[in-house]
């Protein structure tokens, strides 16, 4: 293999890999025909002048997970064919000016997970062919104007997990080919108007986990190709009426974990490709008519863990495709009988952990395909006669933790439950709250001093499992949560959903045992 250093392995495919703590300098001699070189998990602390001088055919160079803290400006001299350079997961605080000079073929530059304190326009001025620049996980506090002006071919820029407190509106202006921009986990409090105007080809914009309080009305108006927009876990308290009006390609929008108090009608849309909308953990108090009317393809809508006390009868107009609706852990006391009337394809609804005192008899009248209804932990004393009779596919109904009033009026419900016992699940059954002499007794077997004929309990067909998510192990669980996860305590004892990146969403969905998709 034209000479392979003893501390390395060299393959016939011109690939060289040098790993191990015993390595303290770039091994020599490296095979002259090497095209890929990996130096991983060593104790190399610095790169001196031209350690790769004799391997000019090198295309990919990975120097990762080392102790590297110092690089001489000429370290990468003579690597004119290099297309991929990774210096990720080292201890670099400073990049020498001119370090990347002569790397005319460089397309991917990974500088993530170092300790870089600043970048300057001169750092990347020679990298005119660069397509990918990874700077996440450093200590950058600001990006100077002009830093990326020469990177006109850049398609992916990651600045996440830094300490950025503000962004200049001019810093991205020349990045017309950029498709992915990640600014997550910084300290941004606002984004100036015009910041993203030049990003006409942008497909993904990640702004989650910042401290953004306000969005400028036209912030995304030039980003017609945007497909994924992450705004979760910020401090956004209101959405300007037109902020999402020019995003016809959007298929992912996260807004959970903000301070949204209200949503204006038509705020979302038109977004014909959006299939899931996550709005949990906000401060929404009411839903007006037509608030989601542009989301005709929406399949999943999560509004749990807000403060919703009022839903206008036409709030869900237009959501003809909706399959799953999560409204649990809100402040609902009453629901209009027509509120779900337009949701003809709804399969799962979670209403637990509200303050519902009663339900209209026609509440589920047009929702014939319902498979799962979560009503536990409300203030229900009884339910209208026949409320579930037409729901032939219903296979999961949760009614426990309600103050059921077990007088003679409860008989029709009791009899229906007796016939449909398998649908109630085996975990917790509804029990009487009043009168006092029957408190704590099962609603299904309670004697209300009226003869009830013995019944044959029909077999309920096995149902599709878990919309969201009783099956997830209780957190924290270090095997399945990244080290950057920040968890808040679950809102309720009944936990069914977990989240990664910021919030413990175990209780976001609150729907169990029905439907998977």
């Amino acid at each position: 293999y034209h000479g392979c250093p003893s501390e390395c392995t060299c393959s016939r495919a011109s690939q060289v890999e040098c790993t191990g703590a015993r390595i303290v300098a770039v091994p020599t001699p490296l095979p002259w025909n090497a095209m890929s070189l990996q130096i991983l998990n060593t104790h190399i602390t610095e790169l001196n002048e031209s350690p790769f001088l004799n391997i000019s055919a090198l295309i990919a160079l990975r120097i990762e997970k080392n102790e590297l803290s110092r690089i001489t400006p000429g370290a990468f001299r003579n690597l004119g064919s290099l297309r991929y350079l990774s210096l990720a997961n080292n201890k670099l605080q400073v990049l020498p000016i001119g370090l990347f000079q002569g790397l005319d073929s460089l397309e991917s530059l990974l500088l993530s997970s170092n300790q870089l304190l600043q970048i300057q326009p001169a750092h990347f001025s020679q990298c005119s062919n660069l397509k990918e620049l990874q700077l996440h996980g450093n200590h950058l506090e600001y990006i100077p104007d002009g830093a990326f002006d020469h990177l006109v071919g850049l398609t992916k820029l990651n600045l996440g997990k830094n300490s950025l407190t503000h962004i200049s509106p001019r810093v991205f202006q020349h990045l017309g080919n950029l498709q992915v921009l990640r600014l997550y986990e910084n300290r941004l409090t606002d984004i100036p108007m015009g910041t993203f105007d030049g990003l006409v080809n942008l497909q993904e914009l990640a702004l989650q986990q910042n401290q953004i309080g306000l969005l400028s009305p036209g912030l995304f108006h030039n980003n017609h190709n945007l497909q994924r927009l992450y705004l979760s876990n910020n401090h956004i308290s209101q959405l300007p009426p037109s902020v999402f009006m020019q995003l016809p390609q959007l298929n992912r929008l996260t807004l959970f974990g903000n301070s949204l108090k209200e949503l204006s009608p038509g705020i979302f849309g038109p977004m014909p490709n959006l299939r899931e909308l996550w709005l949990y953990d906000n401060h929404i108090s009411s839903l007006p008519d037509n608030v989601f009317s542009n989301l005709r393809q929406l399949q999943v809508l999560i509004l749990s863990r807000n403060q919703i006390s009022f839903i206008s009868p036409g709030a869900f107009n237009g959501l003809t495709e909706l399959r799953e609706l999560s409204l649990h852990t809100n402040a609902l006391q009453d629901l209009d009988g027509n509120v779900f009337r337009m949701l003809a394809n709804l399969q799962n609804i979670s209403l637990q952990n509200n303050r519902l005192r009663q339900l209209p008899g026609n509440i589920f009248a047009n929702v014939n395909g319902l498979m799962a209804i979560q009503l536990q932990n409300n203030q229900l004393e009884n339910l209208p006669l026949g409320i579930f009779d037409h729901l032939g596919k219903l296979c999961e109904l949760r009614l426990y933790d309600n103050p059921w009033r077990c007088d003679s009026d409860i008989l029709p419900l009791r009899n229906w439950l007796l016939l449909n016992q398998p649908r109630l699940g085996t975990d917790t059954v509804p029990v009487c709250f009043s009168p006092a002499n029957v408190r704590g007794q099962s609603l299904i077997i309670i004697n209300v001093n009226v003869a009830v004929p013995s019944v044959h309990v029909p077999e309920v067909p096995s149902y599709p499992e878990t919309p969201w998510y009783p099956d997830t192990p209780s957190y924290p669980d270090t095997t399945s949560v990244s080290s950057t996860t920040e968890l808040t305590s679950p809102v309720e004892d009944y936990t069914d959903l977990t989240t990664i990146q910021v919030t413990d969403d175990r209780s976001v969905w609150g729907m169990t045992q029905a439907q998977s998709g």
Epitope: R228, N251, R252, R275, E276, R296, Q297, Q299, V300, T320, E321, R323, E324, A344, N345, Q347, M371, Y463, P464, E465, T466, W468, Y469, D471, T472, Y475, D477, S480, V481, D496, L497, T498, T499, I500, Q501, D505, V508, W509, Q515, S516, G517
Partner: antibody, heavy 119, light 110 residues
Framework: EVQLVQSGAEVKKPGSSVKVSCKAS????????IHWVKQAPGQGLEWIGL????????NYNQKFKGKATLTVDTSTTTAYMEMSSLRSEDTAVYYC????????????WGQGTTVTVSS | DIVLTQSPDSLAVSLGERATINCRAS??????????MHWYQQKPGQPPKLLIK???SLESGVPDRFSGSGSGTDFTLTISSLQAEDVAVYYC????????FGGGTKVEIK
């Protein structure tokens, strides 16, 4: 390039467990649903369940509830399926696959992991 | 669970000829906007490959000789001009509720 690379073939004794891994690369792992599908020898395809790495949540086909456990490790962008109390009928190729939204089709698949249960 | 029945079980078609595979669901898997039916191709020793999503939407990179149609309970995958590389087993799958697959249709060259 989107890739789902699964762990190698396993031969297990009846009653034991197996944990199959699915290493994702080329896409944002936490942004897609990961499905698991079983294909017994000479048979068709059977959906086991899904996991959504972004929130760690799972859905199972009732048939595999208690048999399969789906987890993720976001730090290594890897999904896992553990099968317990193995029996001969669990002998199959197991696939992981990616889906964009919960109800979408599975657009990329792993190469499959053969699990053989034999005494 | 929704049962998907594919027909025929196997199909022999001359090169360049049309191949048609049917999939019938035991209940509707369609709304006014979407049909939650998808089609996959599986070659020996390989994982399935997505061809058609939501009944008629061609997956990126799939040759346009493949097309899908249908709604409600009846769906069709058509290969307009069979090529040698199309020899495979084809499966339909729905995502209406718990996902199930059809039994597969083996396509061979006559």
């Amino acid at each position: 390039e989107v890739q789902l690379v699964q762990s190698g073939a396993e031969v297990k004794k009846p009653g034991s467990s197996v944990k199959v891994s699915c290493k994702a690369s080329g896409f944002t792992f936490t942004d897609y649903y990961i499905h698991w599908v079983k294909q017994a020898p000479g048979q068709g395809l059977e959906w086991i369940g899904l996991v959504y790495p972004y929130i760690g949540g799972t859905n199972y086909n009732q048939k595999f509830k208690g048999k399969a456990t789906l987890t993720v490790d976001t730090s290594t962008t890897t999904a896992y399926m553990e099968m317990s109390s193995l029996r001969s009928e669990d002998t199959a190729v197991y696939y992981c696959a990616r889906g964009d939204n919960k109800y979408d089709a599975m657009d990329y698949w792993g190469q499959g992991t053969t699990v053989t249960v034999s005494s | 669970d929704i049962v998907l029945t594919q027909s025929p079980d196997s199909l022999a078609v001359s090169l360049g000829e049309r191949a048609t595979i049917n999939c019938r669901a035991s209940q509707s898997v369609s709304t006014s906007s979407y049909s939650y039916m998808h089609w996959y191709q599986q070659k020996p020793g390989q994982p399935p490959k997505l061809l058609i999503k939501y009944a008629s939407s061609l997956e990126s990179g799939v040759p346009d000789r493949f097309s899908g149609s249908g709604s409600g309970t009846d769906f069709t995958l058509t290969i307009s001009s069979l090529q040698a590389e199309d020899v495979a087993v084809y499966y339909c799958e729905h995502s209406w509720e718990i996902r199930t697959f059809g039994g597969g249709t083996k396509v061979e060259i006559k």
